[in-house]
Interface confidence: low
């Protein structure tokens, strides 16, 4: 999906209003020095992409993240601020809405949450950058 | 054009050292899960070390574990593998991978054109 | 370990005609989070391998619509719906589902 014609405000107030809080409380217990945060981003739809790509592909190291509140919440957000959007992810998501709910949250997928704190921290500057 | 190409390969005899690098180019080198598989000649592909993007967590093949190291460099788009006390059975073509995590569901999308490492006295 | 076992080891394919190669794990690749960790990768003589299909039965970018994967659990089958030259080489399944990442032997495809 390109996400050149999203609308980046919309989805930044969203962010900052609930997906934050979300993703926050989900890496609650963890120092912010506990991993290192390597992922980046060069401009708004790239970021998007990226965030797109580690909060919902799968991986058998971290299952359960597209199950998660702020995974719900972010495909909302794109849904409604990305036209066309969420025609491209009905395939992409069928196996997700079958998957069962976990409640254990694990180290490995901590390490994946950290760096989607700093694909949206990212996000919002190159926002602020170009106004 | 994204490219992944090895270097560091050559001859080394057996208990001796190697260190293989992996140069990474066109996409997000620190975005991604990076795989070493290496191919002895005429036989299939066997999976060596992978290592998540943030270096968190790495994991071995059995059958290096305890001699080789994988690392990688973020700030450099590099990926490393250190292979110590080497032998014969290690004689292999080594490819850098990118893959092994969340992109593609684990598999191993983008390949370097590999570099041969020959074990002998 | 998970063992992938590939068959037929070789194969010899008319232009045109289609081809069929299994690949059976010694245990079922399918995750709690419904996705099956099974892909597929060509390696065309002289070359490295590539990723044709992924999770199963998605293609890779730029793989052409003829070959496609299919399959659950245990068994996987990748089909060629019309071989064509450029597809003779040696393919692999792997799964990816736990460490050790395993390979099956590979088959090889041959022009007749």
């Known amino acids: 999906y390109d996400f050149t014609n999203c609308d980046f405000q919309k989805i930044e107030a969203d962010y900052l209003r609930t997906i934050s809080k979300d993703l926050i409380t989900y890496m609650s217990g963890t120092k912010s020095t506990d991993f290192n945060n390597t992922v980046s981003c060069s401009n708004r739809p790239h970021c998007l992409t990226e965030i797109q790509s580690l909060t919902f592909n799968p991986t058998p190291r971290c299952a359960s993240l597209a199950k998660e509140m702020f995974a719900r919440k972010t495909k909302a957000t794109l849904a409604l601020w990305c036209p066309g959007y969420s025609e491209t992810q009905i395939n992409a998501t069928q196996a997700m809405k079958k998957a069962r709910k976990s409640k254990v949250t694990t180290n490995k997928c901590l390490e994946q949450v950290s760096q989607l704190l700093g694909l949206w921290r990212r996000f919002i500057r190159t926002l602020l950058k170009k106004q | 054009e994204v490219q992944l190409v090895e270097s560091g390969g050559g001859l080394v005899q057996p208990g001796g050292s190697l260190r293989l690098s992996c140069a990474a180019s066109?996409?997000?080198?620190?975005?991604?899960?990076m795989t070493w598989v290496r191919q002895a000649p005429g036989k299939g592909l066997e999976w060596v070390s992978s290592i998540t993007f943030a270096s968190s967590y790495i994991y071995y093949a059995d059958s290096v574990k305890g001699r080789f190291t994988i690392s990688r460099d973020n700030a450099k788009n590099s990926l490393s593998l250190q292979m110590n006390s080497l032998r014969a059975e290690d004689t292999a073509v080594y490819y850098c991978?990118?893959?092994?995590?969340?992109?593609?569901?684990?598999?191993?999308?983008?390949w370097g054109q590999g570099v041969l490492v020959t074990v002998s006295s | 370990d998970i063992v992938m076992t590939q068959t037929p080891l070789s194969l010899s394919v008319t232009p045109g005609e289609p081809a069929s190669i299994s690949c059976r794990s010694s245990?079922?690749?399918?995750?709690?989070?419904?996705?099956?960790?099974l892909h597929w990768y060509l390696q065309k003589p002289g070359q490295s391998p590539q990723l044709l299909i992924y999770?199963?039965?998605h293609r890779a970018s730029g793989v052409p619509d003829r070959f496609s994967g299919s399959g659950s659990d245990t068994d996987f089958t990748l089909k060629i719906s019309r071989v064509e030259a450029e597809d003779v080489g040696v393919y692999y399944c792997?799964?990816?589902?736990?460490?050790?990442?395993?390979f099956g032997g590979g088959t090889k495809v041959e022009i007749k």
């Open positions: 792997e799964q990816t589902l736990q460490t050790p990442f395993t």
């Open positions: 991978t990118r893959g092994g995590g969340a992109y593609y569901g684990g598999s191993l999308d983008v």
């Open positions: 999770l199963v039965s």
């Open positions: 066109g996409f997000t080198f620190s975005n991604y899960d």
């Open positions: 245990q079922s690749l399918l995750h709690s989070n419904e996705y099956t960790y």
